[in-house]
């Protein structure tokens, strides 16, 4: 779930079941004020989709999405 | 508090090579994926190399083969081996824990003959 919008959105629940890759478009870390920290990635249908970033998953799409820009 | 210290950085000459050292504290430092980023003055910041929590990693096309990224989970830090260093590597090298956008103070690698 986020609170807000994009720049200064929160995760307070995490997905729990991985994404799959190609239906994921861009991401956004959520802002260092949050109580826990928090990927947000955008989905290709633009649903903003709250990933724990302690799960290899997230760690790996993350670095794809920054190498490939 | 999140806190990262890099360090490592210096003069060199092309085709040398540097190790930089980053050392994390305030997270959970096991559990998170690292970069290396860099920023060149007037551009962005920009990843260079990362490792997963399992230690999978990941490098830009620009460094493969001559960077390698490792970490040390016991002493709370991540490296960045550069080897056969050019003067495009040139730039301040940051480190920072994927989902916890912290930023250190970063450290000068300069490469030039």
């Known amino acids: 779930s986020l609170a807000a919008d994009t720049p200064t959105a929160c995760c307070f629940s995490y997905t729990s079941r991985q994404i799959p890759q190609n239906f994921i478009a861009d991401y956004f870390e959520t802002s260092s004020q949050c109580s826990k920290p928090g990927v947000i990635f955008l989905t290709k249908r633009s649903r903003q989709v709250c990933a724990d970033p302690s799960e290899e998953w997230v760690q790996k799409y993350v670095s794809d999405l920054e190498l490939s820009a | 508090e999140v806190q990262l210290v890099e360090s490592g950085g210096g003069l060199v000459q092309p085709g040398g090579s540097l190790r930089l050292s980053c050392v994390a504290s305030?997270?959970?430092?096991?559990?998170?994926?690292l970069g290396w980023y860099r920023q060149v003055p007037g551009g962005q910041r920009e990843l260079v190399a990362s490792?997963?929590?399992?230690?999978?990693?990941n490098y830009a096309e620009s460094v493969k083969g001559r960077f390698t990224i490792s970490r040390d989970n016991f002493k709370n830090t991540v490296y960045l081996q550069m080897d056969n260093l050019k003067p495009e590597d040139t730039a301040v090298y940051y480190c920072?824990?994927?989902?916890?956008?912290?930023w250190g103070q970063g450290t000068q690698v300069t490469v030039s003959s």
């Open positions: 920072s824990a994927i989902g916890w956008r912290y």
């Open positions: 305030g997270i959970n430092f096991s559990r998170y994926g």
């Open positions: 490792i997963t929590s399992g230690g999978s990693t």
